[in-house]
Amino acid sequence: SGVFQLQLQEFINERGVLASGRPCEPGCRTFFRVCLKHFQAVVSPGPCTFGTVSTPVLGTNSFAVRDDSSGGGRNPLQLPFNFTWPGTFSLIIEAWHAPGDDLRPEALPPDALISKIAIQGSLAVGQNWLLDEQTSTLTRLRYSYRVICSDNYYGDNCSRLCKKRNDHFGHYVCQPDGNLSCLPGWTGEYCQQPICLSGCHEQNGYCSKPAECLCRPGWQGRLCNECIPHNGCRHGTCSTPWQCTCDEGWGGLFCDQDLNYCTHHSPCKNGATCSNSGQRSYTCTCRPGYTGVDCELELSECDSNPCRNGGSCKDQEDGYHCLCPPGYYGLHCEHSTLSCADSPCFNGGSCRERNQGANYACECPPNFTGSNCEKKVDRCTSNPCANGGQCLNRGPSRMCRCRPGFTGTYCELHVSDCARNPCAHGGTCHDLENGLMCTCPAGFSGRRCEVRTSIDACASSPCFNRATCYTDLSTDTFVCNCPYGFVGSRCEFPVGLPPSFPW
């Protein structure tokens, strides 16, 4: 679809005569009829296949034609066509004299024609005007013409329809040849496909408008390149959606079971060495001078009564020092200069000679101790109470005051919260310092294993030969993805070696 445009520029009829030679009275009031038809080697009579147009009276005898409009007529004249421009044409222009206002052919005098010209030739679609001048015996017509495409039509023959749009069906403008030119942010044959945010993951992300990155189920992050771990995953990560691969030191389906209490909680004090001894269980090995479950209690080095023979102990920064009573010497006053003759045994202790009288030993009555029976027995000295229990002397005996959560003569027993079997669904109960903990079987979770969850069917490593295990959370089953060379539901059979069945 396009328009043949004809711009009439100047008409000269100096003598003011008709084609018949008769003069116009008072002058030739001139209007034009234009016929555009398909190319003919000799212009033939017959229909104006490409269209016709008439002008109003444009002037008298000789005149220039204004560019825009004159007397209601348009200049350039428009001859629209709704087919592919063939590149060739025939053009016939007639100048007529109109004595009155009625320009219909039947209303004109029989010899009203002033002049008639015909041209034929090639004409390509384009913006440039072709200038032409046709001269007859008495008249001259100067004009120019061109063919341009109608709105939304493009190409060498105005045959390509392209209408710019910015809606659901496309986002583009049209190039001069009619090809689409996508608006920024759009791509595809019809520019319907948005260009997602730069870096948006090709598979895991998508967009409905440019510079957007919407994540498919199981993915997150600005570029949809981060997987979403299994719902409830506490201390774990994923490489594909809904996985829960535990961080170091954590276990269980949701990686919420602490396997490294030492690292995560640092319970041992005063530089003690911590050893994991099970789930939420640990043992502290204290440095010298400290005691207690968490080595939180500072010990005096004299508390162990290292001085013998009635020596008195003095604490020092780098240890202790024994002040020996007369007759004794040595680091711990362990060497004696006395014999039984010196009556060295106190509190009714009886003396026995040793090494031919070079030494002696005291046999102490009950409740007294020491190399000279100089000390009343302190039954707590050996720190018999376990788990941080406090030792109390009670006359001839002693007792331990236990910390909460411990019992027994020496506080050696945990108070058993597990006695009443609090773990549901066959969970295993563990006594802890401040309570208990349930280790749940596969498929259960919660503090008391009371919550039904998906079984991590892969937890038992059912796949052989380094196959990848995938858990189907909807059916609590596993699927093995076999490496090259292995087959079978667990990838247990090498390819080419049939399984050996027992029958």
């Epitope: 017959g46 007639e94 010899d111 024609l113």
Partner: antibody, heavy 119, light 111 residues
Framework: QVQLVQSGAEVKKPGASVKISCKAS????????IHWVKQAPGQGLEWIGY????????NYNQKFKGRVTFTTDTSTSTAYMELRSLRSDDTAVYYC????????????WGQGTLVTVSS | DIVMTQSPDSLAVSLGERATISCRAS??????????MKWFQQKPGQPPKLLIY???NQGSGVPDRFSGSGSGTDFTLTISSLQAEDVAVYYC?????????FGGGTKVEIK
């Protein structure tokens, strides 16, 4: 009113020439084309060709080319057809008819001229 | 050349009845959506008279009972109610290509 008046009947010997006239009136002769059509006795119509009066361009039926010539005199609004080397099968009524560029077709015809070729 | 074939060669129709004449071209006579087809009526001793141009348009002063239809290669002239003055020979003619050619004619008579 529109009229096309043709010259009278002609009797010619084989090998001779004949020139028929067609005088137009009642319309702008120059704007139109003049066709010539042959009708042999008891036969149908056969198109010979046309002339454009405004620029004297002609278009002939190949069958008659070389023996026929169209001319026009715009000052007298008359068109002519000359047929040469006459043969007996040229015996026919020859019509002129006007035509135009806006496809009304051959809407007005002359009364016809009978040309008899006989030795 | 484009050959125009008319049928029937002759046709006898009662007064007031419909008469239909067909014309077939050896190739399409359409160009740019226009059919370059005309119908003429010729009465004895008279020149032809234009009835229909561009396949379906009536010529000046032609009665409404004459109508034309068709496109491409097949065309029809219809006289809806035959009158006595319609006795004549009817010709189709194409003007798409030089040489312009006529059909052989159909003679219409009163039955």
């Amino acid at each position: 009113q529109v009229q096309l008046v043709q010259s009278g009947a002609e009797v010619k010997k084989p090998g001779a020439s004949v020139k028929i006239s067609c005088k137009a009136s009642g319309y702008s002769f120059t704007a139109y084309y003049i066709h010539w059509v042959k009708q042999a006795p008891g036969q149908g119509l056969e198109w010979i060709g046309y002339i454009a009066n405004y620029n004297r361009a002609t278009n002939y039926n190949q069958k008659f080319k070389g023996r026929v010539t169209f001319t026009t005199d715009t000052s007298t609004s008359t068109a002519y057809m000359e047929l040469r080397s006459l043969r007996s099968d040229d015996t026919a009524v020859y019509y002129c008819a006007r035509d135009y560029d806006y496809d009304v077709g051959m809407d007005y015809w002359g009364q016809g001229t009978l040309v008899t070729v006989s030795s | 050349d484009i050959v125009m074939t008319q049928s029937p060669d002759s046709l006898a129709v009662s007064l007031g009845e419909r008469a239909t004449i067909s014309c077939r071209a050896s190739e399409s006579v359409d160009n740019y959506g226009i059919s370059f087809m005309k119908w003429f009526q010729q009465k004895p001793g008279q020149p032809p008279k234009l009835l229909i141009y561009a396949a379906s348009n009536q010529g000046s002063g032609v009665p409404d009972r004459f109508s034309g239809s068709g496109s491409g290669t097949d065309f029809t002239l219809t006289i809806s109610s035959l009158q006595a003055e319609d006795v004549a020979v009817y010709y189709c003619q194409q003007s798409k290509e030089v040489p312009w050619t006529f059909g052989g004619g159909t003679k219409v008579e009163i039955k």
